[in-house]
């Protein structure tokens, strides 16, 4: 009996092939792993993405797929190769029984296997039965350049391309990879099928209500009429974009992914590859009122992940749920009651809400920025989006308490001028995942490939930590934080900056023998101090110890507790100058801050001393925040004195280069 969706109609019972005997065993000591969606209802067992090792060629992928079919046939199992991936990730998509997973994991070249899972449109309501006139206020919103040099790819539902908002602006590609709609009585109605994609295309580039009115778009259908798709379909869509880019290279590309599924290693990996090929990916954080790191592609570090706020800059509530939050969100954008094209008719408008709408706003802003400065890299674009955002306007009380410090308080905004930001030294703060509570647990925060790690700090809610250090990993510096015995875990916090032609290194001093404290300085000619870190092996640094002695007025020196090793980040870059700002408080307060003034950028943020009542230090925009235990639990002894140390830098070279351009 033929399978209802016809998926098995081409199945071939592969006979035992000669190739079968040639199966090489996987390299000794490397074990392929199996992954599946943590959210059970979203799993799609029976379909698997087999991801092969990075250097695997297409011919090897095809051979591995055939080998799997042959070995499965010997065991009496039917398999169907649905797609062979190349161009983005090597691998293949296979329909097979879960019984074959053990066999598949042992195939040569296999890196990991992921069970397919669902992804969903991130707008609520799916379609409002309401027609709203367009909000056209040309006097209020006339961007200087509507993103005309940029192509925006939209991976979504089908769209109504003849809607007057987007007519002539959106090219519907022939790409379609969607699952069957759920339910036997589902009635496909064109306007419902097109609703989500049409609205988002309008938000990005609509004539009246669009952000980047000049941007051209291409749509790929990866979500069905119910707004549902699959990880595998999205992967094939991303591969399609990469192949299009290779066949016909155009200007800057922005890819909008207004969808979310459970955490997916393979979807994140594909996004990473596409981002490293120079494509800007923007995605919805998700509408689950949850940590965005639990969803994909929201959790992919290379993707710009957007949460939703309303007109009052408050996080959007969507029924019982709402916008996602946490360290995987880059910034927020308007996502409540957004007026845009409705697929009910070619002149209809409708209001929709969700992180999809927020992501569409940011995709539009990105298109405009890239149109003004087509050479911007992903890292430069992300830093500019952060820099020009409205700061500290979101009511953080909406977020769970443990997520407030991790969630960026940033709402996307168009830059006041699309040119002339080149002189600025841009930095952002990157939080690691939580280390977990074990004694030797560590957490690692990393910068993007073309960013410099200029400083490293750590934070623990319990105060039990063993500091942090900058260390080399794969030819790049990373920030590693260390948990302490009895601690609930730590975060590492990296300060990641755009510093062209920089040469940075870490200078370390081991714990000092003398009671003077440990110190380390930047001794190389032309190198300036951009950050200080300290790490210690003792469990409770500083308790009943003599106070830390710090030399007066030493801008190029890191100083710390005598039982700690101290790490100085020292950088040489054209025109780079830095200064230290040190704010001390005489008695414990829950927070002490120190900010860099206009024209200077915070590169380093640390706390002195490293004693156990200091929870840690982290940068929020241009302010260094040092958090301590509650005053009432610490008392007001001299042991309670805390100092926040900020290192503020600027680049005279960038400023001069910018002036020469003008």
């Amino acid at each position: 009996q033929e399978d209802e969706d016809g998926d098995y109609e081409e199945l071939v019972l592969a006979l035992r092939s000669e190739e079968d005997g040639l199966a090489e065993a996987p390299e000794h000591g490397t074990t392929a792993t199996f992954h599946r969606c943590a959210k059970d209802p979203w799993r799609l067992p029976g379909t698997y993405v087999v991801v092969l090792k990075e250097e695997t060629h297409l011919s090897q992928s095809e051979r591995t797929a055939r080998r799997l079919q042959a070995q499965a046939a010997r065991r009496g199992y039917l398999t169907k190769i649905l797609h062979v991936f190349h161009g983005l990730l090597p691998g293949f998509l296979v329909k097979m029984s879960g019984d074959l997973l053990e066999l598949a994991l042992k195939l040569p070249h296999v890196d990991y296997i992921e069970e397919d899972s669902s992804v969903f449109a991130q707008s609520i309501p799916w379609n409002l039965e309401r027609i709203t006139p367009p909000r056209y206020r040309a006097d209020e919103y006339q961007p200087p350049d509507g993103g005309s040099l940029v192509e925006v790819y939209l991976l979504d539902t089908s769209i109504q391309s003849d809607h007057r908002e987007i007519e002539g602006r959106v090219m519907v590609t022939d790409f379609e990879n969607v699952p069957e709609e759920d339910g036997t009585r589902f009635h496909r109605q064109a306007s419902k099928c097109d609703s989500h994609g049409t609205h988002l295309a309008g938000v990005v580039s609509g004539r009246d209500a669009g952000v980047a009115k000049g941007a051209s778009m291409r749509s790929l259908r990866v979500l069905n009429c119910q707004g549902k798709g699959t990880v595998s379909g999205t992967l094939i869509g991303l591969e399609f974009i990469r192949k299009s880019q290779l066949v016909q290279p155009v200007g800057p590309l922005v890819v909008l992914l207004p969808l979310a599924g459970g955490y997916s290693r393979v979807l994140n990996a594909a996004c990473q590859r596409l981002a490293r090929a120079g494509v800007v990916l923007v995605t919805a954080a998700g509408n689950f009122r949850d940590d965005a790191c639990l969803y994909s592609p929201a959790s992919a570090p290379e993707v710009i992940t957007v949460g939703a706020t309303n007109a009052q800059d408050q996080p959007v509530t969507l029924g019982t749920l709402g916008t996602n939050f946490g360290r995987c969100v880059d910034l927020f954008a308007p996502g409540e009651d957004i007026i845009g094209a409705s697929s009910d008719c070619s002149t209809c408008f409708v209001s929709q809400s969700g992180t999809s709408q927020a992501a569409a706003h940011v995709a539009g802003i990105a298109a405009m920025m890239l149109s003004a400065e087509p050479e911007l890299t992903l890292a430069e674009l992300r830093q500019r989006l952060i820099h020009f955002s409205a700061k500290d306007v979101i009511n953080e009380a909406w977020f769970p308490e443990d997520q407030r410090v991790l969630t960026p308080n940033l709402v996307a905004a168009l830059p006041p001028s699309t040119h002339g930001a080149g002189w600025q030294l841009f930095c952002r703060t990157v939080w690691s995942a939580h280390s977990g509570p074990t004694r030797m647990a560590t957490a690692v925060a990393r910068c993007a490939p073309d960013e410099e790690l200029l400083s490293c700090s750590s934070f623990s809610r319990s105060g039990k930590r063993r500091g942090e250090r900058m260390e080399a990993q794969g030819g790049k510096l990373v920030c590693r934080a260390h948990n302490a015995f009895g601690g609930e875990g730590v975060y590492a916090i990296a300060r990641c900056c755009l510093l062209p032609q920089a040469n940075c290194s870490v200078h370390t001093a081991p714990p000092a023998e003398a009671s003077m404290g440990t110190r380390v300085h930047c001794h190389q000619q032309g190198h300036v101090l951009t950050g200080c870190s300290s790490h210690w092996e003792v469990e409770d640094l500083g308790t009943h110890k003599p106070p830390v002695l710090r030399p007066r007025g030493q801008p190029n020196q890191c100083v710390g507790h005598r039982e700690a090793s101290i790490h100085a980040s020292c950088c040489h870059a054209p025109g780079l100058e830095c200064k230290v700002k040190e704010h001390g408080i005489p008695a414990p307060q829950e927070q002490v801050t120190v900010a860099c003034e206009e024209g200077w950028t915070l590169t380093g943020c640390s706390a002195l001393p490293g004693t156990s009542h200091v929870l840690g230090a982290y940068a929020v925009d241009n302010t260094c925040v040092v958090r301590s235990r509650d005053v009432s639990t610490t008392g007001s002894t001299s042991e309670g004195a805390v100092t926040a140390v900020a290192i503020c830098c600027r680049s005279r070279h960038l400023a001069q280069a910018s002036q020469e351009l003008q």
């Epitope: 200064k579 040190e582 704010h583």
Partner: nanobody, 127 residues
Amino acid sequence: QVQLVESGGGLVQAGGSLRLSCAASGRTFSVYAMGWFRQAPGKEREFVAAITSPGDSIPYAHSVKGRFTISRDNAKNTLYLQMNSLKPEDTAAYYCAATKSGNYNYMGPDPKKYHYWGQGTQVTVSS
């Protein structure tokens, strides 16, 4: 150089108020933070409060928090200390101090990191 001159001290009843002023002159553009310290007879110099020109985070000594308020008028190059609900233990000579701005900028309770000092003004609180 920066010159600092305090004024406003005197004798006051417990529970009363005083407002101290500190006028800065000279190279005031080179000042980063300004602060108040006090020294009772036979005791070490004690930090009271400090402020930077942008008025960042303002630290106060635990013993004066909620009663004393520090402020700064940049246009007049003057630092103030509003002292309310005074207690006999607030009796001391009150000194104004300033730190330099430059590559290393300090605001906090460590008197050794202050570069410029005034002559002091006496505050006596009687019970």
